[in-house]
Amino acid sequence: EVEKTACPSGKKAREIDESLIFYKKWELEACVDAALLATQMDRVNAIPFTYEQLDVLKHKLDELYPQGYPESVIQHLGYLFLKMSPEDIRKWNVTSLETLKALLEVNKGHEMSPQVATLIDRFVKGRGQLDKDTLDTLTAFYPGYLCSLSPEELSSVPPSSIWAVRPQDLDTCDPRQLDVLYPKARLAFQNMNGSEYFVKIQSFLGGAPTEDLKALSQQNVSMDLATFMKLRTDAVLPLTVAEVQKLLGPHVEGLKAEERHRPVRDWILRQRQDDLDTLGLGLQGGIPNGYLVLDLSMQEALS
């Protein structure tokens, strides 16, 4: 807390300019009018203030706006944004995407800070849903943003926003998140033709059910092994050898290298060995010829 002292004669700041960097902490406190600072916030970012001086400027704004800063000030905070605590930011009402962009720019190229996380949370809650423009902006600054959301939060993403998602934005998503995103993507891309549809839906397929994988196998999509390895195990298990062969096309040969890894390993265990042999890949571990396979889950459902 800076002590209240009178401003020395002739030192009262008439504008926010570089002469202020020579002011001591107490002089900044005494000689800079908070209302002047608020109207000229955009100048602060071009002036080499020390961290200590930035603390004083923040203190002045806090006194002027105890209930939270207005958006006109927030938009021009620049470096000062990084001096804000999440508690400060929770008092704000940020509605403009331009304000959000301006503040994200301050932290560009760095991991999401607690300040940024709180800002985004406030912004998205204020909007009620993650619209396309917001998602576009957030994933541009933080490619992993989407995968940082809980399945519950992802449920508020409208299908139209899915068009903004790039494959790399889904790199760190887990199956629970893809379970939520996949139906939205399916809806968003439903009017596209086969090959174009597959290109768009491919990175969401970790949430696809068996029926959709069976349908894709009829469309000559040539799914790569990297995508196949990310599919849900429970969705892959019911696929026949013929369906997997059609689904992967020329990439089917890659199964051999992955035969010890899920979901390939578990899928092999469910197939008849003679069906696997038709692939000519030397895959081993299938059900020996002459064995009867009882689907106990089906039996339980019937009883």
Partner: antibody
Framework: QVQLVESGGGVVQPGRSLRLSCAAS????????MNWVRQAPGKGLEWVAV????????YYADSVKGRFTISRDNSKNTLYLQMNSLRAEDTAVYYC????????????WGQGTLVTVSS | DIQMTQSPSTLSASVGDRVTITCRAS??????LAWYQQKPGKAPKLLIY???SLESGVPSRFSGSGSGTEFTLTISNLQPDDFATFYC?????????FGQGTKVEIK
Amino acid sequence: QVQLVESGGGVVQPGRSLRLSCAASGFTFSSDAMNWVRQAPGKGLEWVAVIWNEGSNKYYADSVKGRFTISRDNSKNTLYLQMNSLRAEDTAVYYCARDRGPLWPLDYWGQGTLVTVSS
Amino acid sequence: DIQMTQSPSTLSASVGDRVTITCRASQSISRWLAWYQQKPGKAPKLLIYKASSLESGVPSRFSGSGSGTEFTLTISNLQPDDFATFYCQQYSSYSRTFGQGTKVEIK
């Protein structure tokens, strides 16, 4: 006068950890940001990390993200660099350096401490 | 990250010469550029900040200029003590990237 003294360097095997320290004196440590900069033998300077005066803002070079952690103890006037999963390419002299604001240069530097990562 | 490119990488000169080192930024950094001098086995020393401001105690034969993306360091009357490696560094972002260095050696 401002003084920065690094310590904690030495020889370490790849994959192991090391913690560097930088003892500061001659200025108000809690008012300024502190940086780590390194220099591989015969090479140029590479900025590694910065921590702001209050300790809550930390930024890292891509080459060390997720492996190195910068921290500070303002009550002890000491800066730290925790280095995990060390690689041969982390071999360098590590300098600590001060900056007084987001738009200030590195005005004071320590003498450096050598870290050698080798099996 | 902002890339900094220095040229030349090595410069041979004689005492009394005027030498110029250039530094180019991959994007505009306004005037937030510093120049450092480093001698073998020693820590870098700040010479110039904000592109053209001379650090206290640095001889006036050192000068800097430029803004945006193009910057120069000039030593107007090279002295025996000036043979060293010089680095530029941008500090307009928190990732304070350096140029690769220019070694000024005796011709």
